[in-house]
């Protein structure tokens, strides 16, 4: 048997992804155990296979289709059961009932690339993969710029309170190296979070020209 | 600029059918959902239901769901709205709209359907 | 089905003063909450989404917030275009319910 707490959270990429993470305090490291995924309408359920990734915690990626199809829609309601392998049976050790659209986690943005740089400022763009058509422009950004000298952690949050797929950073310093992320959050869901941060781009600011006042 | 144009109004015998349509322009028509809505005099706004153009799937109100059919044309870029059974109380105004599922965005200007014997 | 209930049915109120109109849902539906306007002889217009954000191109006299299941409008400066009938929208369980409508009229 397993004791101890549990703690079993799942995210919706809003297309075709489920990505779960169970927790137990005290959970047996050699034991087999999956997540099952059963919607309420669907002819279809997916299963996945928990993989650790700390001492107490495994994780794993339901795949419902192809990367940017549809499966879910705000309607379904998936019940969503960790089991774990006890000798030929398998124990039900945590259990959901888990509304997609209410739990969302988009997936970082890609394609970052630098539209135009000066010396004291630079345009930046992105692209957002895999999210729903649902969200037509509803969808919100924070980006950060990492500085010489400082961590990610210092770096001023930027908020983009509209679907905007690029930026203009100002009042930068010229000859410059920078690093740029941005992350997504659709407005939709009481228990919706942040993408993970993109890749970080890097760039470097356009030296200042001699003789000039900078 | 988005547009949604539905067309004209209809006087219905009960038990007859009425579809009604919906020409939009303005967005990609293949990546959106269509929603319709009645409000009639004494009802207020009802939600039908939905068709969503890229899943190829419907959403219907428990209310609605034995009598009406929402489909669409990809070709003309225009949806469809068909009410079965027709009854005294199903006259209203019925509206298309665009949105995402939660809430809608962008409102056609209303089909007035009268059903009387 | 939520029952969405919006208070008062008529609202009389001067121009350039403030109007506050409330919406309750009979169960808890998160910020699932939006807000319509629809004039006569219209179509009702998007205001509000999820309780409180605006909706791009609507004036910043329109505002909403939310304690509970207790959703409010306030429109903090009344212009004449403002009287009309505003609609709340629950979309937190399907079928998705709208209020009665409060129909706020030029005191």
């Known amino acids: 048997a397993v004791n101890g707490t549990s703690q079993f959270t799942c995210f919706y990429n809003s297309r075709a992804n489920i990505s779960c993470v169970w927790s137990q305090d005290g959970a047996l490291q050699d034991t087999s155990c999956q997540v099952h995924a059963w919607p309420d309408r669907r002819r279809w359920n997916q299963t996945c296979e928990l993989l650790p990734v700390s001492q107490a915690s495994w994780a794993c990626n339901l795949i419902l289709g192809a990367p940017d199809s549809q499966k879910l829609t705000t309607v379904d309601i998936v019940t969503l059961r960790v089991l774990c392998r006890e000798g030929v049976r398998w124990r039900v050790m945590a259990i959901q009932d888990f509304k997609p659209f209410e739990n969302l986690r988009l997936m970082a943005p890609i394609s970052l690339q630098v539209v135009h740089v000066e010396t004291h400022r630079c345009n930046i763009s992105w692209e957002i993969s895999q999210a729903s058509h649902y969200f037509e422009r509803h969808l919100e950004f924070e980006a950060r710029t990492l500085s010489p000298g400082h961590t990610w952690e210092e770096a001023p949050l930027l908020t983009l309170k509209q679907k905007q797929e690029w930026i203009c950073l100002e009042t930068l310093t010229p000859d410059t190296q920078y690093e740029f992320q941005v992350r997504v959050k659709p407005l939709q869901g009481e228990f919706t979070t942040w993408s993970p941060w993109s890749q970080p781009l890097a760039f470097r600011t356009k030296p200042a020209a001699l003789g000039k006042d900078t | 600029e988005v547009q949604l144009v539905q067309s004209g109004a209809e006087v219905k015998k009960p038990g007859a059918t009425v579809k009604i349509s919906c020409k939009v322009s303005?967005?990609?028509?293949?990546?959106?959902?269509i929603h319709w809505v009645q409000q009639a005099p004494g009802k207020g706004l009802e939600w039908m239901g939905w068709?969503?153009?890229?899943?190829?799937?419907?959403e219907y109100a428990p209310g609605f769901q034995d009598r009406v059919t929402i489909t669409a044309d990809t070709s003309t870029d225009t949806a469809y709205m068909e009410l079965s059974s027709l009854r005294s109380e199903d006259t209203a105004v019925y509206y298309c709209?665009?949105?995402?599922?939660?809430?809608?965005?962008?409102w056609g200007q209303g089909t007035t359907v009268t059903v009387s014997s | 089905e939520i029952v969405m209930t919006q208070s008062p049915a008529t609202l009389s109120v001067s121009p350039g003063e403030r109007a506050t109109l409330s919406c309750r849902a009979s169960?808890?539906?998160?910020?699932?909450l939006h807000w319509y306007q629809q004039k006569p002889g219209q179509a009702p217009r998007l205001l509000i989404i999820?309780?409180?954000q605006s909706i791009s191109g609507i004036p910043a006299r329109f505002s909403g917030s939310r304690s509970g299941t207790e959703f409010t409008l306030t429109i903090s400066s009344l212009q004449s275009e403002d009287f009309a009938v505003y609609f709340c929208?629950?979309?937190?369980?399907?079928?998705?319910?709208f209020g009665q409508g409060t129909k706020l009229e030029i005191k």
């Open positions: 709209a665009r949105g995402g599922p939660w809430f809608l965005s962008y």
């Open positions: 068709i969503d153009n890229e899943a190829g799937e419907t």
């Open positions: 929208q629950q979309s937190n369980n399907w079928p998705y319910t």
């Open positions: 999820y309780g409180l």
């Open positions: 169960q808890i539906i998160s910020n699932n």
């Open positions: 303005g967005f990609n028509f293949k990546e959106s959902l």
